[in-house]
């Protein structure tokens, strides 16, 4: 009686159970009554990540630098290449098919709203009493240092890009 179902890591073909090819190998020919399944290793830059009966291996993913991508983990015959984004860039999807640079706010501006998957960074000018001296996609405007609370006086006024400079009070002799 020919089988109707096969064990794990086998497949049914021509009324008989053949072994699947192991990960990293592709099917060349099905088994017969007299021969085992014939499999061949995947070529360079190819992979198969499951027990399979595929006749072609899959191409490794290409991490396109024009899309801001770089290789996080090189592919093997059993695994695909994993891409990630260049430093300061962010994947546009879970599959990380491309990247975007979340824009930075200039010195003199702070981040009003951090970038999301829907909207880019929103910047706002630092109002009087606040400053930002960096280009950043995360930093808000910082308040000027309060010299008075440190029992100091303002020696140099702050701007939208610089903090105040505090100094000692002149003591009357």
């Amino acid at each position: 009686e020919p089988p109707t179902a096969c064990r794990e890591k086998q497949y049914l073909i021509n009324s008989q159970c053949c072994s699947l090819c192991q990960p990293g190998q592709k099917l060349v020919s099905d088994c017969t009554e007299f021969t085992e399944t014939e499999c061949l290793p995947c070529g360079e830059s190819e992979f198969l990540d499951t027990w399979n009966r595929e006749t072609h291996c899959h191409q490794h993913k290409y991490c396109d630098p024009n899309l801001g991508l770089r290789v996080q983990q090189k592919g093997t015959s059993e695994t695909d290449t994993i891409c990630t984004c260049e430093e300061g860039w962010h994947c546009t999807s879970e599959a990380c098919e491309s990247c975007v640079l979340h824009r930075s706010c200039s010195p003199g501006f702070g981040v009003k709203q951090i970038a999301t998957g829907v909207s880019d960074t929103i910047c706002e000018p630092c109002p009087v009493g606040f400053f930002s001296n960096v280009s950043s996609a995360f930093e808000k405007c910082h308040p000027w240092t309060s010299c008075e609370t440190k029992d100091l006086v303002v020696q140099q006024a702050g701007t939208n890009k610089t903090d105040v400079v505090c100094g000692p009070q002149d003591r009357l002799r």
């Epitope: 640079l101 824009r103 706010c105 200039s106 003199g108 829907v118 909207s119 910047c123």
Partner: antibody, heavy 119, light 112 residues
């Protein structure tokens, strides 16, 4: 706060030309400045931008032929190899997004200066 | 290049009516979109930024919406003074993208 362009005139094809944009009450070390042009009866065309730290970004067609630079209260647009297709009113405008790179949205515009390229 | 496509090229509506102008980007621009109004012989005027934020002094009859690649400007309770050409502009920057033109082709609004 205001912006005014100057330097537009009638030139022959191939002549280089530099336009100036003079700002008043605008700190060019804080705000970005862009150049936009408009051919007669046509739409707006973005040329490029100079950011607060003097980095420049250009439309793909403008790269190499247009150069934006700035001093304390002026922003220049240097144009080379002019053709009749460059005939347009050229606008200078302040960008207010606060970004450290790339293009910006524009809130204060000059009245424009007309450049006519004709033989 | 990111390409901005604006429709329609022209639209006519009566005083008190509503017009809708669409702007489509060739890739997601993450709500980095502005709208401008331009009248003959004048420079453009900023109406809207970040897709839906009204610029200072712009009446609330102007409404912006959209995300990703699709954006809309709606003008309701049309007034004669709204007769003008309207432009969208993308200011999105990914660090590598370029623009042939950051502006859409424009939409002429005629008020009857």
């Amino acid at each position: 706060q205001s912006v005014e362009e100057s330097g537009g005139r009638l030139v022959t094809p191939g002549t280089p030309l530099t336009l100036a944009c003079t700002v008043s009450g605008i700190d060019l070390s804080t705000w970005t400045m862009s150049w936009v042009r408009q051919a007669p009866g046509k739409g707006l065309e973005w040329i490029g931008i100079i950011n607060s730290d003097s980095n420049t970004y250009y439309a793909s067609w403008a790269k190499g032929r247009f150069t934006i630079s700035k001093a304390s209260t002026t922003v220049d647009l240097k144009m080379t190899s002019l053709t009749t297709e460059d005939t347009a009113t050229y606008f200078c405008a302040r960008g207010v997004g606060g970004y450290s790179s790339g293009p910006d949205y524009l809130d204060i515009w000059g009245p424009g200066t007309l450049v006519t390229v004709s033989s | 290049d990111i390409v901005m496509t604006q429709t329609p090229a022209s639209v006519e509506a009566a005083v008190g009516g509503t017009v809708t102008i669409k702007c489509q980007a060739s890739q997601s621009i993450y709500r980095s979109l502005a709208w401008y109004q331009q009248k003959p012989g004048q420079p453009p005027k900023l109406l809207m930024y970040h897709a839906s934020d009204l610029a200072s002094g712009v009446p609330s009859r102007f409404k912006g919406s959209g995300s990703g690649t699709e954006y809309t400007l709606t003008i309701s309770d049309l007034e004669c003074a709204d007769a003008a050409t309207y432009y969208c502009q993308s200011y999105y920057y990914s660090g590598i993208n370029t623009y042939g033109n950051a502006f859409g082709g424009g939409t002429e609004v005629v008020v009857k």
